[in-house]
Interface confidence: low
């Protein structure tokens, strides 16, 4: 039986992290970075972070935007710094409040 090929360590990227899941950290390390926007009780909820597991990100990142949620993913150090996910419907957050979320 052929030996299984050794797993190559996946490339990890430094990502901007903003949101409750980040705690006190403003960055995280993962195989993909993301920027997401969802609607929660009518308010825009912005989050940024990383997917440690590529499959997890692959599933989420391929989900098409809906009127209530959008996720944009990228690979590269700090690649999500200037990405703001957009909902397909028209609407915007409070001026200047990109990347902030409702408690």
């Amino acid at each position: 039986m052929e030996d299984e090929k050794p797993k190559v360590n996946p490339k990890l990227y430094m990502c901007v992290c903003e949101g409750l899941s980040c705690g006190n950290e403003d960055h995280c390390e993962g195989q993909q970075c993301f920027s997401s926007l969802s609607i929660n009780d009518g308010f825009h909820v912005y989050q940024k972070g990383c997917f440690q597991v590529y499959e997890q990100g692959k599933m989420t990142c391929k989900t098409p935007p809906s009127p209530g949620q959008a996720v944009e993913c990228c690979q590269g150090d700090w690649c999500n710094r200037n990405i703001t996910a957009q909902l397909p419907t028209k609407g915007k957050s409070f001026p200047g409040t990109q990347n902030f979320h409702l408690e």
């Epitope: 009518g42 915007k92 409070f94 200047g96 409040t97 902030f100």
Partner: antibody
């Protein structure tokens, strides 16, 4: 529920500097923009400016360079400084937390400017 | 700056009456409009965001409508606890501005 508690001097003389601080409780400091709003006696509401947890600010141009808003994330506090006050700055000053609307408000601080 | 003109500045109505307040923006604000209630001696309270969306816990007798530059706020059946001053506010651009307020009293 986010709670805001504010404090600062309530009586000032013309040309002095107004200084108010607002403490944020029960909330993630990165969740909101933090604004100051004032209301002269018997009048309407005026937005003074806003800041985020990274210190990015937007101020009302009507107050030119008199307004400074700062943040101390280690204490979950943000502050307002208004220089060269006059009687026209007499008002109740509120700190607020907002996303697309001013969701949470401090109790208000009545500031009187009088010689 | 975007000017928000509210009318009337004050009104008096009986309990159970339908009360309507209007708010006109000096330019199209893309429906980025909120309504607040302020009772005497208290801070304002956000009731409606984005023209017509009620915050959780706000009674259904309050409603909002309009688009573009012209908006209205309605209390379908005025109650004694609705005595307050009501403000509209836009967030289409900076600076953020409020209407001048409408004081509602019981006749």
């Amino acid at each position: 529920q986010v709670q805001l508690q504010q404090w600062g001097a309530g009586l000032l003389k013309p040309s002095e500097t107004l200084s108010l601080t607002c403490a944020v409780y029960n909330g993630s400091f990165s969740s909101f923009y933090w604004s100051w709003i004032r209301q002269p006696p018997g009048k309407g509401l005026e937005w003074l400016g806003e800041i985020n947890h990274r210190g990015r600010t937007n101020n009302n141009p009507s107050l030119a360079s008199r307004v400074t808003i700062s943040v101390d994330t280690s204490k979950s506090q943000f502050s307002l400084r208004l220089t060269s006050v006059t009687a026209a700055d007499t008002a109740t000053y509120y700190c607020t937390a907002h996303t697309r609307g001013f969701l949470y408000w401090g109790q208000g601080t009545r500031v009187t400017v009088s010689s | 700056d975007i000017q928000m003109t509210q009318s009337p500045s004050s009104l008096s109505a009986s309990v159970g009456d339908r009360v309507t307040i209007t708010c006109q923006a000096s330019q199209d604000i893309n429906n980025y409009l909120n309504w607040y209630q302020q009772k005497p001696g208290q801070a304002p309270n956000l009731l409606i965001y984005d023209v017509f969306n009620l915050l959780p816990g706000v009674p259904s007798r309050f409603s909002g409508s309009g688009s573009g530059t012209d908006f209205s706020f309605t209390i379908s059946s005025l109650q004694p606890e609705d005595i307050a001053t009501y403000y509209c506010q836009h967030y289409d651009d900076l600076p953020l501005t409020f209407g001048g307020g409408t004081t509602v009293a019981i006749r």
